[in-house]
Amino acid sequence: KKVVLGKKGDTVELTCNASQKKNTQFHWKNSNQIKILGIQGLFLTKGPSKLSDRADSRKSLWDQGCFSMIIKNLKIEDSDTYICEVENKKEEVELLVFGLTANSDTHLLEGQSLTLTLESPPGSSPSVKCRSPGGKNIQGGRTISVPQLERQDSGTWTCTVSQDQKTVEFKIDIVVLAFQKASSTVYKKEGEQVEFSFPLAFTLEKLTGSGELWWQAERASSSKSWITFDLKNKEVSVKRVTQDPKLQMGKKLPLHLTLPQALPQYAGSGNLTLALEAKTGKLHQEVNLVVMRATQFQENLTCEVWGPTSPKLTLSLKLENKGATVSKQAKAVWVLNPEAGMWQCLLSDSGQVLLESNIKVVPTW
């Protein structure tokens, strides 16, 4: 008996060939021996089987001795043994219809779990193997679970269902709702305008929700809400903003915040949360602000940074075109009685300059 695997909602063609390439009488029946379709004269006739409305045959191939049955919009309950009767012989085809669906919405928040459920006919014992867009392989039986979705799980999952050495492939589009970056750091000189951007890692037709940016300044004992906003059909509107600092927010996506001035008292880290309508949980992005200040006071040239910096970052004071340098893995460096000239304060990570501030030291006579 030939085995054919089908996908729920798809179309399948069950083939039946006569030895003689000519139009002859044929019938397709189900395992109850109830007629699905057949030929009467030159006409296709339909029996009372539940399949009749969704079953058809390629009339153009009849005179070639090909009497296939096409079943549209397959259902799990269409799984059955079908019998083609032609030229006094019977050909049996076992059709097994499978369905693979995500248990919840296919738009899931980062960190949420994804469960794929296999619908299968009674008596079947299929195995399922799924591959994520990032190349992660997961195997299972009736259910496949991915406990914590990551950004890279967004995209088309390819799942292969195997039964009786036959396979059928399903493609499921999963959208992981997250920001493009989990964390970002902005490095600014004191007094500069600061731009914070929070691009999303997905696109939705209608994007509605609300968000808030909480800020923990390095110098402050507790965090505070800097801004709250609403998102309606990708349009941003500010609900509430602190007086200090007076943040500005872009009206369109991606979410964009402007801090008029980078000041040491603002240096710190923030957490932007976005709650989407009809979704449980929130999207998060951490943002850090590092502020640099270079000052000369009497005989002391000082360079300082505020905000979350890694201990491996190097802060240096360097006289332009001269070899004189002072470097430390610290948040402040200074030079006593600096030479006259243009001094550079550099914050670098393994030789890569993250932030630079120039200060001119004038000669004292």
């Epitope: 009467q40 009372p48 089987s49």
Partner: antibody, heavy 120, light 107 residues
Framework: QVQLQESGPGLVKPSETLSLTCTVS????????WSWIRQSAGKGLEWIGR???????NYNPSLKSRVTMSVDTSKNQFSLKLNSVSAADTAVYYC??????????????WGQGTTVTVSS | DVQMTQSPSSLSASVGGRVTITCQAS??????LNWYQQKPGKAPKLLIY???NLETGVPSRFSGSGSGTDFTFTISSLQPEDFATYYC?????????FGGGTKVEIK
């Protein structure tokens, strides 16, 4: 045990629409085909058509242009509408369950029938 | 549509007698034929399916035969409760169609 009960007006004016409902009790409407059959005085039985929850209905070609069948799974009911009626549509209307099993297809459970008269 | 022609349209028979009803299809319907019994004011009841298979609970005096286009229904020994109208019905093709009926009356 499944029981069927037809309901609807016993008298319909010519050119109007005949509307009947069949209530299914003792079982789910979702797993079978349900049909309407009529029997006019002195005449035999005529299959009007059948409906299944997830498929489009099948109608008798002789009535197709005038007939509409629908299912309400929440109420466990199915219904028949026959428009532009004439005296020829006067009959006893039966609702029935269609059953498929090995080598058999037919009506295994019937309602008691409701008489519909078309007259002005 | 498959036309089903039943004959006779009516007959008179005595209790204990043998009754034969024929049904002819306008085209080959294989064995896809049911026989129903209907009593006045009641819905039809299935007696025979697939031309010759006796439905569970139906007395063995009822039988059916035939295939293709010609079918026969027989009551071997008529009982008082058998006086009714009998219908054949094909299920080879949609629409399902019935014969015109045979009324069996007491002689």
């Amino acid at each position: 045990q499944v029981q069927l009960q037809e309901s609807g007006p016993g008298l319909v004016k010519p050119s109007e629409t005949l509307s009947l409902t069949c209530t299914v009790s003792g079982g789910s409407i979702s797993t079978y085909y349900w049909s309407w059959i009529r029997q006019s005085a002195g005449k035999g039985l005529e299959w009007i058509g059948r409906i299944y929850t997830s498929e489009r209905p099948n109608y008798n070609p002789s009535l197709k242009s005038r007939v509409t069948m629908s299912v309400d799974t929440s109420k466990n009911q199915f219904s028949l509408k026959l428009n532009s009626v004439s005296a020829a549509d006067t009959a006893v209307y039966y609702c029935a369950r269609e059953l498929e099993r090995p080598y058999y297809y037919g009506m295994d459970v019937w309602g008691q029938g409701t008489t519909v008269t078309v007259s002005s | 549509d498959v036309q089903m022609t039943q004959s006779p349209s009516s007959l008179s028979a005595s209790v204990g007698g043998r009754v034969t009803i024929t049904c002819q299809a306008s085209q080959d319907i294989s064995n896809y034929l049911n026989w129903y019994q209907q009593k006045p004011g009641k819905a039809p009841k299935l007696l025979i399916y697939y031309a010759s298979n006796l439905e569970t609970g139906v007395p063995s005096r009822f039988s059916g035969s035939g295939s293709g286009t010609d079918f026969t229904f027989t009551i071997s020994s008529l009982q008082p409760e058998d006086f009714a109208t009998y219908y054949c019905q094909q299920y080879d093709n949609l629409p399902l169609t019935f014969g015109g009926g045979t009324k069996v009356e007491i002689k």
